[in-house]
């Protein structure tokens, strides 16, 4: 009899944190709140949404999830946002969300129902049991990429990018070593799913972190890499430095302010 060193399945320890506590209640509550606030989504049955969400990962091996598993949820969460008002972001979620909270006619993925439901949550199940795993879930790097959370975000991000048209904006973190990261969701999914037949221009907003940082971060090699990828896809590329994010937000709130005519 050979002694296998792997942990028995029912005690499987993944490298990532487990499902967010009160996950079902959180998803359901968020759905109810969202559909109350957004009249165009009032028709959505939140119990059905939860059932479809649950059905995507419960009783399935958490390293064997596919986009197909999420299709029932995608169908229930179908939503039309103005295709020319889309804001993508990479590694700078908080500022992107602060921006769309002020500029109400623009939308990040997390301003849509499905993005709002899952934002900052973790979830996974176990093969052949209806249990939710609250102890641990697979880490994208250390365990597997086809885990419930990663596949969800890949699916909704792809659909969001595919829906975009005209000028698409993306907020990028100028404080990172890789301002544009090919391995981010933006770099690996969204960039490649913008449709040239619909999207004319991708406009990058590079957000500066340092108070005295006056460098032109649009000259950064990773921005030039993004420019090259986008141009090869027959989409125009535009890049703007946001030197003062605090002032930028303030000027979005009060565009008439006299100090808002200069470069931000």
């Amino acid at each position: 009899h050979h002694h296998h060193h792997h942990v028995p399945r029912w005690r499987q320890q993944w490298s990532g944190p487990g499902t967010t506590k009160r996950f079902p209640e959180t998803v359901l509550a968020r759905c109810v709140k969202y559909t109350e606030i957004h009249p165009e989504m009032r028709h959505v049955d939140c119990q059905s949404v939860w059932d479809a969400f649950k059905g995507a990962f419960i009783s399935k091996h958490p390293c064997n999830i596919t986009e197909e598993d999420y299709q029932p949820l995608m169908k229930l969460g179908t939503q039309t946002v103005p295709c020319n008002k889309i804001l993508l972001w990479s590694r700078i979620k908080d500022l992107a969300h602060q921006f769309t909270q002020v500029q109400r006619d623009m939308f990040t993925l997390e301003d849509t129902l499905l993005g709002y439901l899952a934002d900052d949550l973790t979830w996974c199940g176990e093969f052949n049991t209806s249990k939710i795993n609250y102890q641990s879930c697979p880490d994208w790097r250390k365990d597997c990429s086809n885990n419930p959370v990663s596949v969800f975000w890949k699916t909704v991000s792809r659909r969001f990018a595919e829906a975009a048209c005209d000028v698409v904006h993306v907020m990028l973190n100028g404080s990172r070593s890789k301002i544009f990261d090919k391995n981010s969701t933006f770099g690996s999914v969204e960039v490649h799913n913008l449709q040239p037949e619909k999207v004319q221009t991708l406009e990058a907003w590079v957000i500066h972190g340092g108070r005295e940082d006056s460098r032109d971060l649009c000259q950064d090699p990773t921005i030039k890499e993004l420019e090259s990828i986008i141009s090869k896809r027959n989409i125009q590329f535009s890049c703007k430095n946001i030197y003062r994010p605090d002032k930028f937000l303030q000027c979005v709130k009060n565009p008439e302010d006299s100090s808002c005519t200069s470069e931000i």
Partner: antibody, heavy 119, light 107 residues
């Protein structure tokens, strides 16, 4: 403010090389692409080619074998060379700035320079 | 290459009249269309991009419409300074190509 100015000889002999320079101000060549467009007298506009901010180029296939666009970022200058010219190359030559970083249409133009090909 | 055809070649009109200029592409250009205005001895001036987006400082009497292969520039009420040649340009694929122009002249 943004300005572009073309300069170069107004008369070129057939079979020789036409050389023009576009000097820009009000923006950096490391931030925008520069396009060359020409217009024969009394006729329409023809796109010649572009040098992107990173230095790569795209040319009109009808002229590709004869055209070279290069630039010197520090001098804010872009140059156009068109070899083996004939009378058909007589035109007003314009340089123009792409509207966005990598822009496929043009928001600022030079005033144009007339080049006549004649012996 | 994509061939852009403008019609009519010339329009003779009076100030105050409504003008409609047509531009047709030899294939779908997916709304990648701009309009320029050119006056004698001057460089072209960008009026409209992406079919409908008016450039800053261009008067609201100018408007654009269309999709697929057929596009239109409209001047709602012709002003004396609007007499010029108008060119459309596609930027869907290289080489970027222009229409042959429509001359709007005073009747």
């Amino acid at each position: 403010q943004v300005q572009l100015q073309e300069s170069g000889p107004g008369l070129v002999k057939p079979s020789e090389t036409l050389s023009l320079t576009c000097t820009v101000s009000g923006f950096s060549l490391t931030s925008y692409g520069i396009h060359w467009i020409r217009q024969p007298p009394g006729k329409g506009l023809e796109w010649i080619g572009v040098i992107w901010r990173g230095g790569s180029t795209d040319y009109n296939p009808s002229l590709k074998s004869r055209v070279t666009i290069s630039k010197d970022n520090s001098k804010s200058q872009v140059s156009l060379k068109l070899s083996s010219v004939t009378a058909a190359d007589t035109a007003v030559y314009y340089c123009a700035k792409g509207k966005v970083t990598t822009g496929f249409y043009f928001d600022f133009w030079g005033q144009g320079t007339l080049v006549t090909v004649s012996s | 290459e994509i061939v852009m055809t403008q019609s009519p070649p010339t329009l003779s009109l009076s100030p105050g009249e409504r003008v409609t200029l047509s531009c047709r592409a030899s294939e779908d250009i997916y709304n990648r269309l701009v309009w320029y205005q050119q006056k004698p001895g001057q460089a072209p001036r960008l009026l409209i991009s992406g079919v409908t987006s008016l450039e800053t400082s261009i008067p609201a009497r100018f408007s654009g419409s269309g999709s697929g292969t057929d596009y239109t520039l409209t001047i709602s009420s012709l002003q004396p300074e609007d007499f010029a040649v108008y060119y459309c340009q596609q930027y869907w694929s290289t080489p970027y190509t222009f229409g042959q122009g429509t001359k709007v002249e005073i009747k």
